[in-house]
Every structure is written in C-alpha cells, then in structure tokens.
C-alpha cells in the first residue's frame, strides 16, 4: 500500500522559507536571517551567498531564494551564476597573469575580454587587404587582386603564428 508523503514525514508540510525544526517537535520554523530554503520539506536552511569585494549584489537574498551576485565595474562575470570575476582590459589588449597586455603585431581584440586573435589572412581567400588591421580591429578584405585595375596589386603578409591566449611579454 502507498501512503502520502505527509503521513510519513511531517516535515513535508514545511513550505519554502522555513525548515523542519527537530529541536521543536518538527514544527516549521522560519529561516533565520541571512539564510533561505528554496523548496519545501527542508530540515535546514542554506546560508545566503555574500556578494562582497569583487562581487556586488544583483539580487538580495530572501527567505526563499539565494542572493545573486555580479561583478564590481572593472571586472566581468565568469562561470555559472557568476562564480568568478575577471578583470576587464581595454580593446586592443588581452588579460595575462601579468595583467592587461597589448595585442602583439598581427593580432587584435575588439572586446574588453578574451584573447587577441590573428588578423584575417585575406590572401587565403584570394582577396586583398582593403583596410589594414590594428590592435583593436581586424583587417578588412577587399576584392581579389585579379579584380583590381591593371597594374595594381596588393600583397598581404601572412598573420604571425601564435599560441592562443598568450602574448609575448
């Protein structure tokens, strides 16, 4: 035969925001300050996440849900639920263990995060460089040299080989 959960376990009647207090005959007690329970029937409340230092509070903790953090300006979130904060860099830079470093020649980064990536090699597509690349911007490829007027030519040097995520220091 099958009994309902509430008959087997009086704690199942305790709603979110409370816990089943064994010290008080298993009555439902509210979660203490700075703690929460997001589901019913819990025997303990979980400690609220603290957003301090590199983290700042995006959503306050309540009796039924944990606090949510994001990062203090100058840093950005990494990981599920913003589990880490990572330093921003300027465009044209990438983050290394030595801090933000300029992209080396032939590479670019157009964001405040991520690594410097090699400029597009236009010649691989049979095209020419229309606009040169910079540390912040990729090259712009134009028509193929054959499409240019007679006598005109454009030579695209190959992008330097580079291990992703590392700049020469």
């Amino acid at each position: 035969f099958e009994r309902t959960r509430s008959l087997q376990d009086p704690c199942s009647n305790c709603p979110a925001g409370t816990f089943c207090d064994n010290n008080r005959n298993q009555i439902c007690s509210p979660c203490p300050p700075n703690s929460f329970s997001s589901a019913g029937g819990q025997r303990t409340c979980d400690i609220c996440r603290q957003c301090k230092g590199v983290f700042r509070t995006r959503k306050e903790c309540s009796s039924t849900s944990n606090a949510e953090c994001d990062c203090t300006p100058g840093f950005h979130c990494l990981g599920a639920g913003c589990s880490m904060c990572e330093q921003d860099c300027k465009q044209g830079q990438e983050l290394t263990k030595k801090g933000c470093k300029d992209c080396c020649f032939g590479t670019f980064n157009d964001q405040k995060r991520g690594i410097c990536r090699p400029w597009t090699n236009c010649s691989l597509d049979g095209k020419s460089v229309l606009v040169n690349g910079t540390k912040e911007r990729d090259v712009v490829c134009g028509p193929s040299p054959a499409d240019l007027s007679p006598g005109a030519s454009s030579v695209t040097p190959p992008a330097p080989a580079r291990e992703p995520g590392h700049s020469p220091q």
């Epitope: 590199v54 990494l78 990981g79 589990s83 880490m84 904060c85 990572e86 330093q87 263990k97």
Partner: nanobody, 123 residues
C-alpha cells in the same frame, strides 16, 4: 566557511608606508594564486598585484611597480601587501582575492574576496 579578512589600512601622508595583511581561513592558502585589487573613490575596481602558490611569481600593475611588494606566508595562511612611497592616487579600498580553480591556465577569475581595508593618502 571560506573567508578572507583584510587589515592594516589607515591614514598616511604622501611618501609614507603601510603594510596590509589578509588572513585566510576555510581553505588551504598554498593551493591558490592570490591577488590584491583596489577601488578608488568613484572609480571601478583595479587589479594591483598577484602572487603564485609558492611566491616565486609576482606581478604588478604598472602604476605600483617598484613601490608595492606582494608576499605570502602559507604557514600562517596570510597574504601581505607592503606599500611604500604612497601617493594620493593610491587612496582606495584594498581587497585581497583568491584566484579560482584553473587561474592562470584558462582564466584569471577571482572567486573569493574580503570586505576590504581602506587606505587614505593625504597630507
């Protein structure tokens, strides 16, 4: 509970010195890269320095090179920042922060930091 607690801040005159400390608890300090970051009034957060697990690698933001020294004592579960030749622009709240798992390999994320200690440089 994993915790970092900073101390040692205060009011100091330009050219003076301070030594900040950070006491770590709830984890093994020697397993992690550690960092100091700071936030000046009305500004964003700025990375200051970091140090690897055994103290053999130390890096600094350009503005503090030659003036600040980061160090650690793993036996005492403590991180330090010796600040010399202090300038008005060093005025900030200073936080110690732990590099997350994989720091320096596939990210430079910080996963734990303290409440901060305030450094004011003024005459």
């Amino acid at each position: 509970e994993v915790q970092l607690v900073e101390s040692g801040g205060g009011l100091v005159q330009p050219g003076g010195s301070l030594r900040l400390s950070c006491a770590a608890s709830g984890f093994t300090l020697s397993n992690y890269w550690m960092n100091w970051v700071r936030q000046a009034p009305g500004k964003g957060l700025e990375w200051v320095a970091n140090i690897n697990q055994d103290g053999s690698e130390r890096y600094y933001v350009d503005s503090v090179k030659g003036r600040f020294t980061i160090s650690r004592d793993n036996a005492k579960n403590s991180l330090y920042l010796q600040m010399n030749s202090l300038r008005a622009e060093d005025t900030a709240v200073y936080y110690c922060a732990r590099g997350g798992e994989g720091y320096g390999v596939d990210h430079y994320g910080l996963d734990v930091s303290g409440q901060g200690t305030t450094v004011t440089v003024s005459s």
